[in-house]
Structure formats: structure tokens, C-alpha cells
């Protein structure tokens, strides 16, 4: 969490912004919050980039503007028009690329006086894995799939009852380059499972970490999948 | 409901520049995308460029060089002009606009003129 | 720039049939995804916005689906008034680009 004050001017107000990532081709929010003004028209919103010249977006007077806007943000941002007046100065950004990484200043004014707070923004791809039994083949054999990962994750098999065990002698993991060249899809098989047994395959970058956990029993399978973003910190 | 209608000479001469304006009636022009498209006679839709109602402009890289689309708000209108043209910028060209939530160009384009066409010859 | 493609360029229907119209995106583009259609000598008509959001007023025989890089439009029951050219255009990011458009024609 980034707490921002006014350095400035008839006096500072706060602004509180959160460290987040991005998942590329998705849509990502650049949080950032701050101390309500009464008019929306005296409430100035203004993103920047370190390392831009032009602004990632403006807001004043009640409405977008947008005339200094740097072309690579053009037709890609917006604010939360309706919740400005509630202190909610967030960006959705559409598309979210690499190059969108960096860190971003949320600058704010209204009539009480002036706040920025900075945001380290992480680009990457991150998605769900499944695990499935794999009845292709020759022994029991499990399958985590995640079509997207970006930078290329760690993968990590671990068992309910043999905690704390080293699968990597029985395992084997791939990654493979999509389409668009950047991202890859995760593919690892755990060889030689065990019947009434979880396991779980965890996919892990500095990003984000995700895990999918899969239950085999004689009657049924049973799958749970979550995800979690790292360092989401607030400032 | 909001209308747009284009207007602009139905010919012009190979290399000069081709003016088009279109007026937008029975809405607000500020806080939307404005956009122009054309279509060249038996083909299909091609972007053009759009303009945000406070004057920030992203054009089709294949057209930027002779593309300029400006804004006045006080008459309601956004323009298109594209320079140095040529037979093959005979076309018909619509302009629109863009919808969205919170006023990004997200929805398609919603409202769009009738169209008008323009020809290039000598 | 990215690319759209659309398949078929031509298909012959006869009234009531369910059609489909395939756009294909060179990149992901999440939902961002338009549909519209163009009658001869007309402006286009948007019917679906972001991939599956019917345009308001437009007949609920008209559907749109999926993400990423593969889309389709549905007709669920061909009308008369249904034939015409459908052309599917990407809003991700700038340049917004259109697909080479679909003329659906009486069999």
C-alpha cells in the first residue's frame, strides 16, 4: 500500500494506491483511491508513466481530457466516471502488453488541495491450471495444463500423503510458445500416482502463483483450482 | 436520437486534398470517440481514424502520413482531411460513433451517417 | 496491426435456416469484437457488441459468442430482411480493423 500526500499548494490530501499485475491481452485496474471533494467538477485526475512524455490518462471537470494523452494509451483507458465523486480514482486499462509494466503516478486535485501516490504495475500472463488423470497412458499418470503462463513459471508436484516429497524424478514438465510468441502454455505429468491421494501442481512466476489440486479416489475425482497474484501491496 | 451527416464535394482532383465534415445532431459531441470509416465501391469497411471530443487523435497507420481529423465542439462537428489523394481513396465515407462504458471506444460504433461518397478524378 | 478474417465470404441460406459466420482475430482480443450488418447502398448497423452483447433494439435471433481469437454470429432463424453482408471489426486496441465481410445470400 503506497500512501501519497500533497506536498504542495493549500494542503495535501491522501491518495493510497496498490501494487497489482497484469494479465497480457486482458484488461487490467490500476487502483487508486483518495480523500472525496463534494464537486466533481474541482476533482482533477491525472495518470502518468515513468518514462512516457504524454499523460495515460486525464480527468477533470467531469469528464475525460484527453488531448495530451500519450498515443501508446490511446483508445485503451478509462476512469470509473460514476465513482470519481466517492474517491475511487482507478484506471482500467484495456489490452493489457508487456511493455505496460513500470511504475505510474496517480495525481490527484480537488478543492481540499493535492496528493500522488506511485503504483509499480507487473505485466504478464497467468491462468488456472486443470489437472486431470491422464488415460492415455501406459500407468497411472496425472496432467496439469495451463494455457498461459508468462515469464516462464516454476512447476511443483507435492502429495497429502507424502508431504514434503521430491517429484521431480517422476515428473516431467513443458512449456510451450503460443501463437503471439510471448506467452506459454504450462503441460506437466506426474508418473506413478497413488489412488485416495491429492495432489497438487503449482505453477509459480513473480506474478502470480497458482495451484490445481485434483483428489482420486476408486468412486470419484475431485478438482479445486486457485490462483493468487504476488506482491499485490498497497501505497 | 443522436444523427450524423457528412457532407463534403463529391469530387476531387488527384492530389488534393479531399475535406470532409460531419455534424452531429440530437447529442453532445463531448465525452465520445468520433470516428471515420470508408469503403471503397464493391469492397469492404476500413478504418480510418477516430478523434476523442477533447482533441486526441489515433489514425490507421496505412493513412496516417495524409490523415488529419480535427474537433470543434462548439459547432458540434469533427472533420476529416486527407491529402495528396488518389484513385484509389475513391470511396464512401461514413463517420460514427464510438460507444462504451465510461466513454472508452469498447462498444462498436453505434450511430453511424448515412455516408457520403467521394470520387477522385481529373 | 492485427489481422481479421472472415469465413465464408459467400453463404447461400434458404429462410429459417440457423447460420454461422466465423471471424477469426491474428491475436487475442479478449471480447473486444463488433458485428455488423450492411445492406446495399446502407450505412453498417452494429447488432452485437463485446462478442455476445446484443445491441439494443436488434432481434434476439442474432447471437454472437466467443474469445480470444475465434468468434462467431449466429442467426438462429434466417428472416428476409436477414440477407445482406456482416463484417466483424476488433475495438482492442488502435488500429480498430474489420473483417472482409460475409455476404449471406437466397439460396
Known amino acids: 500500500l503506497i500512501i501519497g500526500f500533497g506536498i504542495s499548494g493549500r494542503h495535501s490530501i491522501t491518495v493510497t494506491t496498490v501494487a497489482s499485475a497484469g494479465n497480457i491481452g486482458e484488461d487490467g485496474i490500476l487502483s487508486c483511491t483518495f480523500e472525496p471533494d463534494i464537486k466533481l467538477s474541482d476533482i482533477v485526475i491525472q495518470w502518468l508513466k515513468e518514462g512516457v512524455l504524454g499523460l495515460v490518462h486525464e480527468f477533470k471537470e467531469g469528464k475525460d481530457e484527453l488531448s495530451e494523452q500519450d498515443e501508446m494509451f490511446r483508445g485503451r483507458t478509462a476512469v470509473f466516471a460514476d465513482q470519481v465523486i466517492v474517491g475511487n480514482a482507478s484506471l482500467r486499462l484495456k489490452n493489457v502488453q508487456l511493455t505496460d509494466a513500470g511504475t505510474y503516478k496517480c495525481y490527484i486535485i480537488t478543492s481540499k488541495g493535492k496528493g500522488n501516490a506511485n503504483l509499480e504495475y507487473k505485466t504478464g500472463a497467468f491462468s488456472m491450471p486443470e489437472v486431470n488423470v491422464d488415460y492415455n497412458a501406459s500407468s497411472e499418470t496425472l496432467r496439469c495444463e495451463a494455457p498461459r503462463w508468462f515469464p516462464q513459471p516454476t512447476v511443483v508436484w507435492a502429495s497429502q500423503v507424502d508431504q514434503g516429497a521430491n517429484f521431480s524424478e517422476v515428473s516431467n514438465t513443458s512449456f510451450e510458445l503460443n501463437s503471439e510468441n510471448v506467452t506459454m502454455k504450462v503441460v506437466s505429468v506426474l508418473y506413478n500416482v497413488t489412488i485416495n491421494n491429492t495432489y497438487s501442481c503449482m505453477i509459480e512466476n513473480d506474478i502470480a502463483k497458482a495451484t490445481g489440486d485434483i483428489k482420486v479416489t476408486e468412486s470419484e475425482i475431485k478438482r479445486r483450482s486457485h490462483l493468487q497474484l504476488l506482491n499485490s501491496k498497497a501505497s | 436520437q443522436v444523427q450524423l451527416q457528412e457532407s463534403g464535394p463529391g469530387l476531387v482532383k488527384p492530389s488534393e486534398t479531399l475535406s470532409l465534415t460531419c455534424t452531429v445532431s440530437?447529442?453532445?459531441?463531448?465525452?465520445?470517440?468520433w470516428g471515420w470509416i470508408r469503403q471503397p465501391p464493391g469492397k469492404g469497411l476500413e478504418w480510418i481514424g477516430y478523434i476523442y471530443s477533447s482533441g486526441s487523435t489515433s489514425y490507421n497507420p496505412s493513412l496516417k502520413s495524409r490523415v488529419t481529423i480535427s474537433v470543434d465542439t462548439s459547432k458540434n462537428q469533427f472533420s476529416l482531411k486527407l491529402s495528396s489523394v488518389t484513385a484509389a481513396d475513391t470511396a464512401v465515407y461514413y463517420c460514427?460513433?464510438?460507444?462504451?462504458?465510461?466513454?472508452?471506444?469498447?462498444?462498436?460504433?453505434?450511430?453511424w451517417g448515412q455516408g457520403t461518397t467521394v470520387t477522385v478524378s481529373s | 496491426d492485427i489481422q481479421m478474417t472472415q469465413s465464408p465470404s459467400t453463404l447461400s441460406a434458404s429462410v429459417g435456416d440457423r447460420v454461422t459466420i466465423t471471424c477469426r482475430a491474428s491475436?487475442?482480443?479478449?471480447?473486444?469484437l463488433a458485428w455488423y450488418q450492411q445492406k446495399p447502398g446502407k450505412a453498417p448497423k452494429l447488432l452485437i457488441y463485446k462478442a455476445s452483447s446484443l445491441e439494443s433494439g436488434v432481434p434476439s435471433r442474432f447471437s454472437g459468442s466467443g474469445s480470444g481469437t475465434e468468434f462467431t454470429l449466429t442467426i438462429s432463424s434466417l428472416q428476409p430482411d436477414d440477407f445482406a453482408t456482416y463484417y466483424c471489426?476488433?475495438?482492442?486496441?488502435?488500429?480498430?480493423?474489420f473483417g472482409g465481410g460475409t455476404k449471406v445470400e437466397i439460396k
Open positions: 440530437g447529442g453532445s459531441i463531448i465525452s465520445y470517440y
Open positions: 491475436q487475442s482480443i479478449s471480447s473486444w
Open positions: 471489426q476488433q475495438d482492442n486496441s488502435f488500429p480498430f480493423t
Open positions: 460514427a460513433r464510438g460507444s462504451g462504458l465510461y466513454a472508452a471506444p469498447d462498444y462498436g460504433l453505434d450511430v
